[in-house]
């Protein structure tokens, strides 16, 4: 019986060349979180392990920064970063909880005139 829920920043937009924080929060469960994985489609971006700390995938280490908290900061954004991002919480004894965030990276002028998905 998995009672937990993942809250995310939902659909967000950011400016090309800028940065964005991806945040998820697991609530409504007392389960022990052992690890959080951040993935983009099928690519692993980063892992935060309760005992071992952060590991950033080598192919992303120049553009991904750990935190704040269990979140992930994406830097030097390109239009190719547009897409789905997933936070995967590994917990005991509940198992796995997954949250989804959709990021749209916009050309600077577009972002200035309407961040369609920006969450206040």
């Amino acid at each position: 019986m998995m009672t937990g829920t993942i809250e995310t920043t939902g659909n967000i937009s950011a400016e090309k060349g800028g940065s964005i924080i991806l945040q998820c929060h697991l609530s409504s469960t007392t389960a022990q979180v052992t690890q959080v994985n951040w993935e983009q489609q099928d690519q692993l971006l980063a892992i935060c392990n309760a005992d071992l700390g952060w590991h950033i995938s080598p192919s992303f280490k120049d553009r991904v920064a750990p935190g704040p908290g269990l979140g992930l900061t994406l830097q030097s954004l390109t239009v190719n970063d547009t897409g789905e991002y997933f936070c995967i919480y590994h917990t005991y004894p509940d198992g796995t909880y997954t949250g989804r965030i959709f990021l749209e990276v916009l050309e600077s002028s577009v972002a200035e005139h309407g961040a369609r998905f920006q969450i206040p």
């Epitope: 019986m1 009672t3 022990q32 979180v33 309760a50 005992d51 005991y92």
Partner: antibody
């Protein structure tokens, strides 16, 4: 073998304050959730407070009857957990146990306890 | 909060007798979050059974646990003198964590 030792119990007047300490030896303290549980003939075993890991931003939880009066904290560098108790009441009397928990390792160890007596 | 009610409060058993202690929850508890502790006089509680049915390290195989939802039990297949103790059920499924009032098991 992991060992826990509590300190700081004793006799205190109603409305007074007391700080309990618990020191762990024999394991990597920072990997474990820490709890305080108390026991009295009137109330039996009663969970009091929990503090999780740095990984969890040191999240704390309390039983309702002590919220605003008790504060749990930890110092991983000293392998210690603390319980600051203010505005003590007669019903806070009991044996206070410090417990060290790692759910996914089926690990759950208790100290020998320290007695707190609230009486005028 | 989830209230755990244990019965009986006190019981005694002959050596070799089968013993069953029960723990009833006021609302459903996931079986993974239901633990049992053993406590002997002048000692602190020891984890005895975790996740409803798994024996903690060093616990004799004559102990077993079962249950789901709101009804759980601890069984000793053949009572021995060293099993005389108090047994407490515990849930950490929701805050506040709670304990049952305990069953004091005596040997006849």
């Amino acid at each position: 073998e992991v060992q826990l030792e509590e300190f700081g119990g004793g006799l205190v007047q109603p409305g007074g304050s007391m700080k309990l300490s618990c020191v762990a030896s024999g394991s990597t303290f920072s990997n474990y959730w820490m709890n305080w549980v108390r026991q009295s003939p009137e109330k039996g075993l009663e969970w009091v407070a929990e503090i999780r890991l740095k990984f969890n931003n040191y999240a704390t939880h309390y039983v309702e009857s002590v919220i605003g009066r008790f504060t749990i904290s930890r110092d991983d560098s000293k392998s210690s957990v603390y319980l600051q108790m203010n505005n003590l009441r007669a019903e806070d009397t009991g044996i206070y146990y410090c417990t060290m928990v790692r759910r996914n390792w089926y690990f759950d160890v208790w100290g020998a306890g320290t007695t707190v007596t609230v009486s005028s | 909060q989830i209230v755990l009610t244990q019965s009986p409060a006190i019981m005694s058993a002959f050596p070799g007798e089968k013993v069953t202690l029960t723990c009833s929850a006021s609302s459903s508890v996931s079986s993974s979050y239901l633990y049992w502790y053993q406590q002997k006089p002048r000692s602190s509680p020891k984890l005895w059974i975790y996740s409803t049915s798994n024996l903690a390290s060093g616990v004799p195989a004559r102990f077993s646990g079962s249950g789901s939802g709101t009804s759980y039990s601890l069984t000793i297949s053949s009572m021995e003198a060293e099993d005389a103790a108090s047994y407490f059920c515990h849930q950490w499924s929701s805050y506040p964590y709670t304990f049952g009032g305990g069953t004091k098991l005596e040997i006849k």
